[in-house]
């Protein structure tokens, strides 16, 4: 007996061929021996089975001895043994219909779990193998679970259902709701304008929710809310903003915040949260601000950075076109009685300059 696998909602064609290439009488029946369809004269007739309005045949192929049955909009309960009767012979085809669906919405927050459930006919014992867009392979039986979704899990998942050495492939589009970056650091000289951007890693037709930026300044003992905002159909509106600093926010996506001036008292780290309508949980992005200041006071040239820096970062003071350099893996470096000229303060990571500030030392007469 031939086995054919079908997908819920799809169309399947069960083939039946006569030995003679001519139009002859045929019938398709189900396992209850109830007629689904057949030929009467030159006309296709439908029996009273549940498939009556979803079954059809390719009349154009009848005179070639092909008497296939096409079943549209497959349902799990269409799984059955179908019998084609033609030329006093019977051909049996076992149809097994499977469905694979995500247990919840296919738009999930980063960190949430995804469960894929296989609908299968009674008595079947299928296996399922799924491959994520990032190439992660997961195997299972009736259910497949991905405990913690990551950004790279966004996209089309390809799942293969196997039964009786036959396979059927499902494609499920999963959207992981997250910011493009988990964390970002902005390096600024004191006094410069600061731009914070929070691009989303997904697009939705209607995007509604609310958000807030909490800030923990390095110098402060506790964190505070710098701004709260609403998002309605991709339009941003500020609800509340602190007086110091007075942040400005763009009205369109991506979420965009402007801090008029980078000052040492603002250096620190923030957490932007976004709660989306009809979704449990929040999207998070961490943002860090590192501020650099170079000063000359009397005979002391100092360069300082504030904010979250890694211990492996190097802070250097260097006289332009001269070899004189002071470097430290610290948050402040200084030179006593510096030579006159243009000094550069550099914050670098493995030779890559992250931030630089120039200060001119004038000769003292």
């Amino acid at each position: 007996k031939k086995v054919v696998l079908g997908k819920k909602g799809d169309t399947v064609e069960l083939t039946c061929n006569a030995s003679q290439k001519k139009n002859t009488q045929f019938h398709w029946k189900n396992s209850n021996q109830i007629k689904i369809l057949g030929i009467q004269g030159l006309f296709l007739t439908k029996g009273p089975s549940k498939l009556s309005d979803r079954a059809d045949s390719r009349k154009s192929l009848w005179d070639q001895g092909c008497f296939s049955m096409i079943i549209k909009n497959l349902k799990i309960e269409d799984s059955d043994t179908y019998i084609c009767e033609v030329e006093n012979k019977k051909e049996e085809v076992e149809l097994l219909v499977f469905g694979l669906t995500a247990n919840s919405d296919t738009h999930l927050l980063e960190g949430q779990s995804l469960t894929l459930t296989l609908e299968s006919p009674p008595g079947s014992s299928p296996s399922v193998k799924c491959r994520s867009p990032g190439g992660k392979n997961i195997q299972g039986g009736r259910t497949i679970s991905v405990p913690q979704l990551e950004r790279q899990d966004s996209g089309t998942w390809t799942c293969t259902v196997s039964q009786d050495q036959k396979t059927v492939e499902f494609k499920i589009d999963i959207v992981v709701l997250a910011f493009q970056k988990a964390s970002s650091t902005v390096y600024k000289k004191e006094g410069e304008q600061v731009e914070f951007s929070f691009p989303l890693a997904f697009t939705l037709e209607k995007l509604t929710g609310s958000g807030e930026l909490w800030w923990q300044a390095e110098r402060a003992s506790s964190s505070k809310s710098w701004i709260t905002f609403d998002l309605k159909n991709k339009e941003v509106s500020v609800k509340r903003v602190t007086q110091d600093p007075k942040l400005q926010m763009g009205k369109k996506l991506p979420l965009h915040l402007t801090l008029p001036q980078a000052l040492p008292q603002y250096a620190g780290s923030g957490n932007l949260t976004l709660a989306l309508e009809a979704k449990t949980g929040k999207l998070h992005q961490e943002v860090n601000l590192v501020v650099m200041r170079a000063t000359q006071f009397q005979e002391n040239l100092t360069c300082e950075v504030w904010g979250p820096t890694s211990p492996k970062l190097t802070l250097s003071l260097k006289l332009e076109n001269k070899g004189a350099t002071v470097s430290k893996q610290a948050k402040a470096v200084w030179v006593l009685n510096p030579e006159a000229g243009m000094w550069q303060c550099l914050l670098s990571d493995s030779g890559q300059v992250l931030l630089e500030s120039n200060i001119k030392v004038v000769p003292t007469w």
């Epitope: 209850n32 109830i34 029996g47 089975s49 549940k50």
Partner: antibody
């Protein structure tokens, strides 16, 4: 044992719409075809059509243009509407359950029938 | 549509008699035929399915035969409670169609 009960007006004016409802009790309406069959006084049985619980329908071609069938699974009810009625539509209307089993397809449960007269 | 022609339209027989009703289909319906009994003022009741299979609980005096286009329904020994109208019904193709009925009376 599943029971069926037809309800609706016993008198309908010509050109109006006949509306009948069948309530299924002592059983679920799910996973069956539910049909309407009529019988004019002293005459034979005529199959009007059927509806599955999913809402898919099959109608008798002779009445197709005038029939609308619907199902309300939450109320365990299914309904028939027959538009533009004439005196020829006067009959006893039965609601019924159709059943498929090995080698059998037919009506296994019938309502008691309701008489509908078309007259002005 | 498949037309079902039943004959006779009525008959009168004595208790204990053998009664035979025929049903002819306008085209081949294999053995997709049911026989129903309808007593006055009541809904029909299934007696025979698939041309010759006796429904559970139906007395064995009722039987059916035939295939293709010609079918026969028999009551081997007519009983007073068998006074009713008998209908054949095909389920080969939609729409389901019934014969015109045979009214059985007792002499």
């Amino acid at each position: 044992q599943v029971q069926l009960q037809e309800s609706g007006p016993g008198l309908v004016k010509p050109s109006e719409t006949l509306s009948l409802t069948c309530t299924v009790s002592n059983g679920s309406i799910s996973d069956y075809y539910w049909s309407w069959i009529r019988q004019p006084a002293g005459k034979g049985l005529e199959w009007i059509g059927r509806i599955y619980t999913s809402g898919s329908t099959n109608y008798n071609p002779s009445l197709k243009s005038r029939i609308t069938m619907s199902v309300d699974t939450s109320k365990n009810q299914f309904s028939l509407e027959l538009s533009s009625v004439t005196a020829a539509d006067t009959a006893v209307y039965y609601c019924a359950r159709e059943l498929e089993r090995y080698y059998f397809y037919g009506v296994d449960v019938w309502g008691q029938g309701t008489t509908v007269t078309v007259s002005s | 549509d498949i037309q079902m022609t039943q004959s006779p339209s009525s008959l009168s027989a004595s208790v204990g008699d053998r009664v035979t009703i025929t049903c002819q289909a306008s085209q081949d319906i294999s053995n997709y035929l049911n026989w129903y009994q309808q007593k006055p003022g009541k809904a029909p009741k299934l007696l025979i399915y698939a041309a010759s299979n006796l429904e559970t609980g139906v007395p064995s005096r009722f039987s059916g035969s035939g295939s293709g286009t010609d079918f026969t329904f028999t009551i081997s020994s007519l009983q007073p409670e068998d006074i009713a109208t008998y209908y054949c019904q095909q389920y080969d193709s939609l729409p389901l169609t019934f014969g015109g009925g045979t009214k059985v009376e007792i002499k």
